[in-house]
Amino acid sequence: SEVEYRAEVGQNAYLPCFYTPAAPGNLVPVCWGKGACPVFECGNVVLRTDERDVNYWTSRYWLNGDFRKGDVSLTIENVTLADSGIYCCRIQIPGIMNDEKFNLKLVIKPAKVTPAPTRQRDFTAAFPRMLTTRGHGPAETQTLGSLPDINLTQISTLANELRDSRLANDLRDSGATIRIG
């Protein structure tokens, strides 16, 4: 089942997704798509990275974190009710069927009518799967498809739900995470 995140109309939504490069510079292509993760790739791609840069995006979608260190969390600017739905974060690890897929459900709430201090993000988040993997390969920079195949070993799964929006800063520790190397 998908992990749920919430945001209000007019605010920015934040969908966490992380991986740990096997070695500095061993970046892995990532795609974000609207809709559940299909067997391959991402459907309705909204943003994509290669082994170095963001190489495709649509308006209002960006990576605000340090994506070259594995923080590929998606920010959606100025959300509307139409942004509700499932989003797929896919870590495209080289090798047959090695990709890691994370489905995140975004629920958009109507904006509060009563005046209140503006909050940048207001959502309820649950811990997505935490995953650790083991890999192999030299420490030198290898990119653009030169990474070796990586054997994945799933370690743990869904944990307790976070309800306090003040814990948004802790999402680095609770986001969809894959560790390579």
Epitope: V54, D66, T141, Q142
Partner: antibody
Framework: QVQLVQSGAEVKKPGASVKVSCKAS????????MDWVRQAPGQGLEWLGY????????SYNQKFKGRVTMTTDKSTSTAYMELRSLRSDDTAVYYC?????????????WGQGTTVTVSS | DIVMTQSPDSLPVSLGERATINCKAS??????VAWYQQKPGQPPKLLIY???NRYTGVPDRFSGSGSGTDFTLTISSLQAEDVAVYYC?????????FGQGTKLEIK
Amino acid sequence: QVQLVQSGAEVKKPGASVKVSCKASGYTFTDYYMDWVRQAPGQGLEWLGYIYPNNGGTSYNQKFKGRVTMTTDKSTSTAYMELRSLRSDDTAVYYCARSGYGNYYTMDYWGQGTTVTVSS
Amino acid sequence: DIVMTQSPDSLPVSLGERATINCKASQSVGNNVAWYQQKPGQPPKLLIYYASNRYTGVPDRFSGSGSGTDFTLTISSLQAEDVAVYYCQQHYSSPSTFGQGTKLEIK
């Protein structure tokens, strides 16, 4: 010390091609990307693309796609940038520049530049 | 493509005074902005990367700040050798793009 030494100035006619070389020394050639940037006379900087010598992977600016090809010769630690179907507005100084993960793929060492003049 | 817009185009500053150059991205680029210095007849030199990281050997009078869409290069006390053209670059997406340049001169 790191050095990038480029080939000499070129004068070409419209429609012709030019191939600029960039010989690297002082670092492991395959550990870094090689970017190419150009600067028209009195103008700003324009990124053409990059090549990763480790495996030959490339990324080109769409503006030049189909006209530009970047290659490397690992045995001589040399990068090449070929631009075809030259036009007068391709007149510029062409730079090669090294980029790597440590500086978030910004360009920390640059060649001296190669002046390409396109004139009939 | 992401458009980088620098201001001002030209900046006269007295020696010893502070110089501030701004760069605005057409969309958020996180912290992925670099600053380069270019003197006539020379290739650019990297000063700052990832918005605020000073490159090796760059004097500490140069500093960078900002995130998202708005970025600033500050020279705390202008020296004669700082006269040059300064460019911002976004290194977030492909194609990488540069600002149009700011010419820093002595007032």
